[in-house]
């Protein structure tokens, strides 16, 4: 295929308009207007011949580079000859330079000598003598240069004169393509085509409307051999969210179908509560009460919070409750219920409630549980408390309102104590107990009541303060009953599990510790 | 239609300031390098000063260089003169005048001229 | 040198042609740009660069360059052709950006 010159900078065609930079501000290289054929016509010039030591510079507006990799610099421009000028001017040049600079961004006013490179010095084929410019015949000379490769976003160029009598009527820049082709939902644009005969030049393609690169996927790329012709395709574009595949376009979804992310896949249809969607929908917005938690998939139904625990239960024990609840009857058709638990607690005698997160223990953490029970204890003797359990699932954070079911207990007894043999002997048993610290406060006294087992006619009390007794008096290598039960200023507490210890027989004589 | 109406001038006592301006309408003022061109009374037109389109670059005449600021505002559409430490020798009709190519001009539209008067 | 040296003045009678003379080195570099200026008003630019005419200047004003000289011709001049005549160039020499010629009084007889 036939290369096509595809112009990025033509300063004749711009009437003047380009605006581009001199420096030193008009003192070197300024525009100018003449009139032919009633047009008019632009060029840049700089005469200062006669002044010596000439460092005027004109620098071109930032050029986009777009696709071009090697620029071509057509330039078509008069140069007046040194000996128009009295005594041949000695300062007087009959050439100027040619500089480029490449750059991502574009610069504005900020003009650095430094950062351009110099292409070549541009001499003219022929100059314009004396009599030619009074008879205005001009000497028009036409050069050409290129520079490449380019890789920078865009570049400038710039021509520096050094004491010459130069116009600059024309400056145009171009690159050669390959045509436009479409090819996996990309377009590859016109482009350049290889600075040399072996060399193939890699070309961005651009998705089609409403298509994009897949993640992780490769970027759409040809390559485009220098005699115009498109080779190697890589990669490829997938019709985009809201999109699918017709022919080679994409074409948004009907109304009632999504596509929600960038796929081959077709469009599917709205999933359950949700309302029709309108044409290229990603996604299917929700009905109404009905939610789409972040992490859920646009394919995926709508869904609501739960409904409340159902049939919540607290039995307590001593001072222990055994919370256990059933699902919800409406999951809200979700399967990511999780459940929390507060706890409420109310002196009676004040009414005063608050709450005993701090003060009680859970059987486990009470949030985000997924089991339907949880022991709660340590909890305080004569003691009003109000369980909560709430239900909530993946869109909960939704919404404002809460799905619970509440139960409440009052616990009248202490805990029973936890009974220990310490030690025993032929005629002692040694004995321990304790009880969760928040009770100690209301316990007054200890209550140890004891009798031989099989003996149901008599028992024995004793009572202490302290958290220990030694039971003395008994019948050597018997079996006896023990129990321990706390008394506070409201009556007795739970009484301890009754346990079974035995005194040692004469043979096995000492206190010897259990 | 395309014009430029100055204002500011005055008369001002040797060492003085004053500030000239010069409002632009009817072209896109933002385009073109502006002037200022000074005529004494009975003589020629003598060149002041000149600014860039964008505002960046000044230049002036010798006889003004170190009194006199050029500045413009490109959202007002306005060209000022500030003028310093004033002589008797500036007294002189301040036209503002428009490049209509480049920075040098020629320069195809004027102000209508605003006299400066600097006397004791 | 960066300046311009016009006659002080000159005359004409109407219908007549009438040349204005500009002297100057920067003329041998830059195109000489002419203003007319009617008393108590602003100059007018007449004809810049080669020989061009903003729209509205009558066709009887024209310029031309040779050298160091700079002229502007008024072919049939008329009574309100009287005015002062200025040239203007950029300057070669470094010295000032741009230069007025001292003017010429045109008196039209």
């Known amino acids: 295929a036939q290369g096509k010159e595809v112009v990025l900078l033509d300063f004749a065609a711009a009437g003047g308009e380009l605006g581009w930079l001199t420096h030193p501000y008009g003192k070197g290289w300024d525009l100018m207007q003449n009139i032919m054929n009633d047009m008019p016509i632009y060029m840049y010039s700089v005469c200062n011949v006669m002044s010596g030591d000439q460092d005027n510079w004109l620098r071109t507006n930032w050029v986009y580079r777009g696709e071009a990799e090697r620029i071509f610099i057509e330039l078509k421009f008069t140069v007046r000859d040194c000996n128009s000028f009295p005594g041949g001017a000695s300062s007087c040049k009959e050439t100027f330079n040619l500089y480029y600079a490449e750059s991502d961004l574009d610069y504005g006013t900020n003009f650095q000598k430094r950062l351009f490179t110099k292409i070549d010095t541009i001499a003219p084929d022929e100059i314009t003598v004396s009599s030619d410019f009074e008879a205005r015949h001009v000497k028009l000379n036409v050069e050409e240069r290129s520079v490449g490769p380019l890789t920078r976003k865009g570049f400038y160029l710039a021509f520096q004169d050094i004491g010459a009598c130069v116009a600059l009527l024309s400056v145009r820049v171009y690159y050669k393509k390959c045509p436009e082709l479409l090819q996996g939902l990309a377009h590859f644009p016109e482009t350049i085509a290889g600075s040399d005969a072996p060399s193939l030049a890699t070309v961005a393609g651009t998705c089609v409307d409403h298509a994009v690169v897949p993640p992780g996927g490769e970027e759409p790329r040809m390559h485009c051999a220098v005699d115009g012709e498109w080779l190697v395709p890589i990669g490829q574009c997938l019709c985009q969210a809201g999109y699918e595949k017709v022919e080679d376009a994409c074409q948004a979804c009907s109304p009632g179908f999504f596509k929600f992310e960038a796929s081959e896949s077709p469009c599917l249809e709205c999933p359950e509560h949700t309302l029709p969607s309108p044409e290229g929908a990603t996604s299917c917005e929700c009905e109404e009460g009905f939610f789409r938690a972040p992490q859920d998939p646009a394919s995926m139904p709508c869904t609501r919070p739960p409904s409340a625990p159902h049939y919540l239960t607290a039995v307590g024990m001593g001072a222990k409750v055994e919370l256990r609840w059933t699902p919800p009857q409406d999951s809200g058709g979700r399967e990511d219920i999780v459940y929390s638990v507060t706890c409420e607690q109310c002196w009676p005698e004040s009414g005063e409630c608050g709450p005993c997160e701090a003060s009680v223990r859970y059987s486990e953490p009470p949030h985000g549980l997924t089991r339907t029970s949880v022991t709660v204890s340590d909890l305080e003797p004569h003691m009003n408390y109000t369980f909560t359990v709430e239900a909530r699932n993946g869109v909960s954070g939704l919404v404002t309102s809460r799905s619970f079911r509440t139960a409440s207990v009052s616990i009248n007894q202490t805990e029973p104590p936890k009974v220990r043999l310490e030690g025993r002997s032929t005629t002692s048993l040694s004995v321990s107990w304790s009880i969760p610290p928040p009770q100690q406060s209301r316990v007054w006294k200890y209550e140890v009541t004891y009798r031989k087992k099989g003996d149901s006619n008599s028992y024995n009390v004793r009572r202490t303060e302290g958290f220990s007794v030694t039971l003395d008096d008994l019948a050597p290598d018997t079996t006896y009953l023990v129990q321990v039960q706390a008394l506070t200023q409201e009556g007795q507490g739970a009484g301890s599990k009754v346990h079974e210890f035995q005194t040692l027989s004469p043979e096995g004589s000492g206190n010897l510790a259990v | 239609q395309v014009q430029l109406v100055q204002s500011g001038g005055g008369l001002v006592q040797p060492g003085g300031s004053l500030r000239l301006s010069c409002a632009a309408s009817g072209f896109t003022f933002s385009s073109y390098a502006m002037h200022w061109v000074r005529q004494a009374p009975g003589k020629g037109l003598e060149w002041v000063t000149v600014?860039?389109?964008?505002?960046?670059?000044?230049y002036y005449a010798d006889s003004v260089k170190g009194r006199f600021t050029i500045s413009r505002d490109n959202s007002k559409n306005t060209l000022y003169l500030q003028m310093n430490s004033l002589r008797a020798e500036d007294t002189a009709v301040y036209y503002c005048a428009r490049a209509s190519v480049g920075a040098t001009g020629p320069f195809d539209i004027w102000g209508q001229g605003t006299l400066v008067t600097v006397s004791s | 040198s960066s300046e311009l040296t016009q006659p002080p003045s000159v005359s004409v009678a109407p219908g007549q042609t009438v040349t204005i003379t500009c002297q100057g080195d920067s003329l041998r570099s830059y195109y000489a740009s002419w203003y007319q200026q009617k008393p108590g008003t602003a100059p007018k630019l007449l004809i810049y660069g080669e020989n061009n005419r903003p729209s509205g200047v009558p066709d009887r004003f024209s310029g031309s360059s040779s050298g160091t000289s700079a002229s502007l011709t008024i072919t049939g001049a008329q009574a309100e052709d009287e005015a002062d005549y200025y040239c203007n160039s950029r300057d070669s020499s470094g010295t000032h950006l741009t230069v007025f010629g001292g003017g010429t009084k045109l008196t039209v007889l």
């Open positions: 600014i860039s389109p964008d505002g960046h670059n000044t």
